[in-house]
């Protein structure tokens, strides 16, 4: 048994790390293999973390950290049995992926304005809170020309569009993603998406 | 929101034993790690040990092996501090402290006088 | 006995900048990373820098910390009565297993 393409991990800097790996040919990865992990710290304990299929030699396992913060490393060490596959170590503050933001609602009542308003995924004892900054993507089905990007860089989770830019009429959807500058991470998914119709006109000219 | 509350204040014989509690509420227990420190009157801050109360293990200053003893009760979200074999120097105000790398919460902190 | 080193005290008009310095060696400072802690007077420590030079929620951006090879830095601007307190440096011993260390103190008086 051999291990073909090494773990890589990403943590969403909460609570799970996700490792992914290939192996040289079809596995049984709940069955055959074990990743074990550690945090180099004192008092620390090993943990076990059992592999799912991801594929025929895929294998993806699901890390629960506690506590994540910048210093922390782990060791990380692939059994299959009585035999070490591989040893390697994660930084979880060098391979960030935020979570999703949540809760993407469209509110249309306000006058000439859509607002949109969505939650911040990490709870504000987190370091991530405070931190993150997020892109809004507008697209209509109606019209597959039109698919705007709102990059958000101020700490509220809200984004304000005048109505008026978009078409009057037709309905448009929206999704949200976030990303933490000082972290250095990559893009979290984007949220489920939410839709709404644009019904405002433009009043009059006198 | 995180609260630790230590117990109250105590007065030791030397050659005594101690034991101060530090109960945590707000914030789910066996997840963060808990540091013990002291300070002496008009002195700085010294490290004593932590404990991990997921596990219950722990890790103690060079200083205070054998003498001290961490442990903790997770059905009532309680780490205990033990100091035995109290001298004069022993009295401090002696903080729990949550967090791994640096502490965010602290205790108020508790009292213990080593006095004949 | 601490192998941090602070001034064991500095003082400042309100108003002005101040800076506390914490100097250590290889084995921590230069192989780890440093949070500050303000404690008032009668009161247990609290968190104002963690990572050198963040701040958790709450603490106002008056408070900084910086890091260069084996000392440490916290610079309070715009300083207030409130602010006159002991602070402790802290980081990691390396060569142990990662036993904390704090500085010996400094005393911040405002004049």
């Known amino acids: 048994m051999k291990v073909l393409q090494e773990p890589t991990c990403v943590s969403d800097y909460m609570s799970i790390s996700t490792c992914e790996w290939k192996m040289g040919g079809p596995t049984n990865c709940s069955a055959e293999l074990r990743l074990l992990y550690q945090l180099v710290f004192q008092s620390s304990e090993t943990h076990t973390c059992v592999p799912e299929n991801n594929g025929g030699v895929g294998c993806v396992c699901h890390l629960l950290m506690d506590d994540v913060v910048s210093m922390d490393n782990y060791t990380l060490d692939l059994w299959a049995g009585q035999q070490l596959l591989w040893k390697g170590s994660f930084k979880p503050s060098e391979h960030v992926k935020p979570r999703a933001p949540g809760n993407l609602t469209v509110h249309t009542n306000v006058s000439d304005t859509v607002l949109l308003t969505w939650s911040n995924p990490y709870p504000p004892d987190n370091y991530l809170y405070n931190d993150l900054t997020y892109a809004v993507n507008i697209w209509s089905e109606n019209d597959p020309a039109y698919s705007r990007i709102h990059n958000v860089t101020y700490l509220k989770p809200t984004l304000r569009i005048p109505a008026s830019t978009l078409k009057s009429g037709i309905s448009y959807r929206a999704r949200v993603r976030a990303w933490a500058q000082h972290y250095n991470t990559t893009w979290s998914e984007w949220s489920p998406s939410t839709k709404w119709y644009n019904s405002y006109r433009e009043p009059f000219e006198q | 929101q995180v609260q630790l509350v230590q117990s109250g204040a105590e007065v030791k014989k030397p050659g005594a034993s101690v034991k101060v509690s530090c109960k945590a509420s707000g914030y789910a227990f066996t997840s963060y790690y808990m540091h013990w420190a002291r300070q002496a009157p008009g002195q700085g801050l010294e490290w004593m040990g932590i404990?991990?109360?997921?596990?219950?293990?722990?890790s103690y200053a060079q200083k205070f092996q054998g003498r001290v003893t961490m442990t903790r009760d997770t059905s009532t979200s309680t780490v205990y501090m033990e100091l035995s074999s109290l001298r004069s120097e022993d009295t401090a105000v002696y903080y729990c402290?949550?967090?791994?790398?640096?502490?965010?919460?602290w205790g108020k902190g508790t009292l213990v006088t080593v006095s004949s | 006995q601490s192998v941090l080193t602070q001034p064991p005290s500095v003082s400042a008009a309100p108003g002005q900048k101040v800076t506390i310095s914490c100097s250590g060696g290889?084995?921590?400072?230069?192989?780890?990373?440093v949070s500050w802690y303000q404690q008032l007077p009668g009161t247990a420590p609290k968190l104002l820098i963690y990572?050198?030079?963040k701040r958790p929620s709450g603490i106002p951006d008056r408070f900084s910390g910086s890091k260069s090879g084996t000392s440490a830095t916290l610079a309070i601007t715009g300083l207030q009565t409130g602010d006159e307190a002991d602070y402790y440096c802290?980081?990691?011993?390396?060569?142990?297993?990662?036993?904390?260390?704090f500085g010996t103190g400094t005393k911040l008086t405002v004049l």
């Open positions: 802290g980081t990691w011993d390396t060569s142990t297993t990662y036993h904390p260390i």
């Open positions: 404990i991990n109360p997921s596990g219950g293990s722990t």
């Open positions: 290889s084995s921590n400072i230069g192989n780890s990373y």
């Open positions: 990572d050198n030079n």
């Open positions: 402290a949550r967090g791994k790398w640096w502490w965010q919460y």
